[in-house]
């Protein structure tokens, strides 16, 4: 018998439930007690190197001492039994680790899946953390045969893949056992035919074929997974345009039975589409396959579905009897062009007579016209055919435009510049909106857009900049020509001015001074100037502020002190804040004009 260890602790390897009580006993060997001249009264208990208070000890007899813990909350406690020898020297007798945790909870939500070509995998929810090594075992049996247990791996404790091959059309019973040092529990049993748990492989070799006859259809073909020989399939077919992020879905009832092709209808002409497909058991019992690899296809072209937006400008400097007219139009967006636009056809008819034809590759055409009334038509052409014609009346030289839009307003909203108006009583064919940036440094180069005659509110479709002043013009277009234009200024987003106004004196008297200033150039305004504030003070006095309406360019300061130096500056304000101009000084005279000391 060895004197070392000098005793032992019982239990040797305890695993206890969290928040429970626990008692350990240290029993000294008689020979050790004899050698060190000690008994159980000399035992000192320690946890993690800290001495446990004596109140927790119980001396059982001369060889044994126990210690009790209540409500254990630590997961690991190093417990040592020590003896006080040779006066106060501490000698370690024995040590154990108290491991605490919780018994396993009943595993829940047990479900199984048979991935085509693979063995059955089941997974479950293990419940709360036990803090202990807990083994999960998947058990399975037929009515007549028990299968080998499937022990979940440590790193994947909530799933297990069985070792045996799947047999379809025979019911199997499956359950999970969870066991650790504190207990063993069993999940509810589930009973099923594995055929209802199949996840097929995705269809493969997906390809897309277009139709030259119909520009709105594409035919998909694919190869079904081999599980098709065991089960009937249904499909989910999704598609999107190449640049879109959201998918559209074919109605499920159209793809609810086994097939290897499908024709997708109601597509846009000359558009690239992306397709994907997945499948599952026809009756919906089981799992959808993963998506197939995506396949792309382009629908065939169709004639342009809309006439281009069409407008004109007349050069103001025209020769006697003639005028230069620039016809202009917008390229059709792809969803209206329905193919590659090859060219445009323009016709000009002078008052029921002479017809001129032009084929143009550009989006403008400059022509010399007499002062008569003309009707212009424009069509866009692609491989398949022509668009409907856009018709424009260019009135005679002496035409008087009337009937403008009313109540024209422009305002920013949601990072766009909106324009709205009240429609005239007369029947409007369309509206032309023109806009340009007002600047002292550059001419107003207009962009434009066309709106349908029924519209009375729209936003400007262009790359608009913040803190720029836009001049927006709305022209109604009638059957006999354009109406009167109406214009309005607007900002997409205002900012404080970049510079403040420069103030100067127009006239200085003994007790008053007339100040004047110039309107800020439009390039530095950055918004609508709503008002000015004039700040003035003497060297020793308080500053006085005066608000002035933005329409003024001069203001008289009164009640000034004679023979005094004044400092004055001025701020201009938009809806987004103000900016000070430079400070200016002036001195009031000692005497009024003609006054003698």
């Amino acid at each position: 018998e060895l004197l070392d260890p000098c005793g032992y602790i019982s239990p040797e390897s305890p695993v206890v439930q969290l928040h429970s009580n626990f008692t350990a006993v240290c029993v000294l060997k008689e020979k050790c007690m004899d050698y060190f001249h000690v008994n159980a009264n000399y035992i000192v208990w320690k946890t993690n190197h800290f001495t446990i208070p004596k109140e927790q000890y119980t001396i059982i007899n001369r060889t044994a001492s126990s210690v009790t813990f209540t409500d254990i909350s630590s997961l690991n406690i190093q417990l040592t039994c020590n003896i006080l020898t040779f006066g106060q020297l501490e000698q370690n007798v024995y040590g154990i680790t108290i491991i605490s945790g919780l018994p396993p909870e009943k595993p829940k939500n047990l479900s199984c899946i048979v991935n085509e070509g693979k063995k059955m995998r089941c997974e479950w929810n293990r419940g709360r953390e036990t803090h202990l090594e807990t083994n999960f075992t998947l058990k399975s049996e037929w009515a007549t045969h028990k299968f080998a247990d499937c022990k979940a791996k440590r790193d994947t404790p909530t799933s297990c893949t069985v070792d045996y091959s799947t047999v379809y059309f025979v019911n199997i019973e499956v359950w999970v056992e969870a066991e650790n040092a504190l207990g063993k529990v069993t999940s509810d049993h589930i009973n099923f035919d594995p055929v209802y748990k199949v996840k097929p492989n995705p269809p493969h070799n997906l390809s897309v074929i277009n139709s030259e006859e119909l520009s709105s259809i594409l035919k998909l073909t694919w190869t079904n997974p081999s599980i098709k020989s065991v089960i009937r399939l249904k499909y989910n077919i999704q598609y999107r345009t190449k640049d879109a992020s959201t998918w559209s879905q074919i109605p499920p009832e159209d793809t609810a039975s086994t097939r290897s092709s499908f024709t997708v209808q109601d597509l846009k002409p000359f558009t690239e589409y992306v397709f994907r497909i997945c499948c599952m058991k026809e009756d919906g019992k089981g799992y959808w396959s993963d998506w197939s690899e995506e396949a792309n296809g382009i629908t065939y072209e169709d004639r342009p579905s809309k006439a281009p937006s069409f407008w004109y400008k007349i050069d103001p400097s025209h020769a006697q009897g003639y005028r230069t007219v620039q016809l202009m139009w917008k390229t059709l967006p792809p969803f209206e062009a329905n193919g590659k636009i090859l060219d445009y056809e323009v016709t000009l008819t002078r008052w029921k007579s002479h017809l001129q034809n032009y084929t143009v590759n550009d989006t403008k055409l400059t022509v010399n016209l007499t002062n008569d009334r003309y009707v212009a038509t424009l069509t866009a052409r692609n491989l398949v055919g022509k668009s409907d014609a856009a018709v424009l009346t260019i009135p005679a030289c002496d035409f008087q435009a009337t009937h403008p839009v009313m109540d024209l307003k422009a305002f920013p909203k949601d990072n766009m510049l909106w324009v709205e108006w009240t429609t005239p009583r007369e029947s409007v064919k369309k509206y032309i909106l023109e806009w340009c940036v007002l600047s002292d440094k550059a001419p107003c180069i207009a962009d434009w857009q066309q709106e349908d005659g029924t519209v009375h509110r729209t936003h400007l479709r262009g790359n608009l900049a913040e803190s720029k002043c836009y001049l927006i013009t709305v022209t109604p277009v009638y059957a006999d020509g354009p109406g009167s234009p109406e214009s309005i200024k607007a900002y997409l987003k205002q900012a404080p001015p970049s510079k403040g106004p420069t103030v100067r004196t127009k006239k200085v008297g003994k007790n008053e001074a007339v100040l004047e200033w110039d309107q800020l150039p439009v390039d530095v305004q950055n918004g609508f100037i709503r008002n000015y504030t004039i700040f003035y003070r003497t060297i020793i006095g308080n500053e006085t502020a005066v608000n002035v309406d933005s329409s003024h360019t001069e203001y008289t300061l009164s009640s000034l002190t004679s023979d005094t130096l004044y400092m004055v500056r001025m701020a201009a304000y938009t809806d987004e804040g103000g900016k000070d101009g430079p400070e200016f000084t002036f001195t009031t005279p000692k005497f009024a004009q003609g006054e003698i000391e």
């Epitope: 060895l2 004197l3 050698y35």
Partner: antibody
Framework: QVQLVQSGAEVKKPGASVKVSCKAS????????ISWVRQAPGQGLEWMGW????????DYAQKFQGRVTMTTDTSTSTAYMELRSLRSDDTAVYYC????????WGQGTLVTVSS | DIQMTQSPSSLSASVGDRVTITCRAS??????LNWYQQKPGKAPKLLIY???SLQSGVPSRFSGSGSGTDFTLTISSLQPEDFATYYC??????????FGQGTRLEIK
């Protein structure tokens, strides 16, 4: 102070038995055991065994198993060692010592085995 | 059984000398080693227990060290009354408790 007082010298014939006593004082007799050690003339020390005065548990050296008996009498705080079937090579001074630490020794008892 | 081997078996030294006696165990005995002094015709006397603890009443010139298998007894400055035989003894494995064969310390 702690004292261990042993019985006097003995002369024995081969085959006889001898019983040596060891009376303890100056401490609680039952708190510690008694060890027995012998020393043949001109030789080193040889451990014979140990007895717990509290429980009566004992350990004998293999060499003496079956020939030696160690006992205690707690009422008189005395320990005894009896050696049987004496041989001439059992001639030695027999010591009792306190505990397995041998911190206090008796004065020794000379046992002579001679025909 | 655990064998205890002392060295040297005997040595001569003078008063005031520093003397070291070693004891080797045939296997580890942790710190369960005692040293005894025995003078002729007398019972042995405990000097050191548990390898390095000085028994009460023993002069401080005696000291012990070591653990496992190798141990030493040191007398820092030899006194006339220190000439005797010294024994080491293990209590780690019992039975049996075993002694070294002894080291005789003589006057030079």
């Amino acid at each position: 102070q702690v004292q261990l007082v042993q019985s006097g010298a003995e002369v024995k014939k081969p085959g006889a038995s001898v019983k040596v006593s060891c009376k303890a004082s100056g401490y609680t007799f039952t708190s510690l055991g008694i060890s027995w050690v012998r020393q043949a003339p001109g030789q080193g020390l040889e451990w014979m065994g140990w007895i717990s005065a509290y429980s009566g548990n004992r350990d004998y050296a293999q060499k003496f198993q079956g020939r030696v008996t160690m006992t205690t009498d707690t009422s008189t705080s005395t320990a005894y060692m009896e050696l049987r079937s004496l041989r001439s090579d059992d001639t030695a001074v027999y010591y009792c010592a306190r505990s397995l630490r041998f911190d206090y020794w008796g004065q020794g008892t000379l046992v002579t085995v001679s025909s | 059984d655990i064998q205890m081997t002392q060295s040297p078996s005997s040595l001569s030294a003078s008063v005031g000398d520093r003397v070291t006696i070693t004891c080797r165990a045939s296997q580890s005995i942790s710190s369960y080693l005692n040293w005894y002094q025995q003078k002729p015709g007398k019972a042995p006397k405990l000097l050191i227990y548990a390898a390095s603890s000085l028994q009460s009443g023993v002069p401080s010139r005696f000291s012990g060290s070591g653990s496992g298998t190798d141990f030493t007894l040191t007398i820092s400055s030899l006194q006339p009354e220190d000439f005797a035989t010294y024994y080491c003894q293990q209590s780690y494995s019992t039975p049996p408790i075993t002694f070294g064969q002894g080291t005789r310390l003589e006057i030079k």
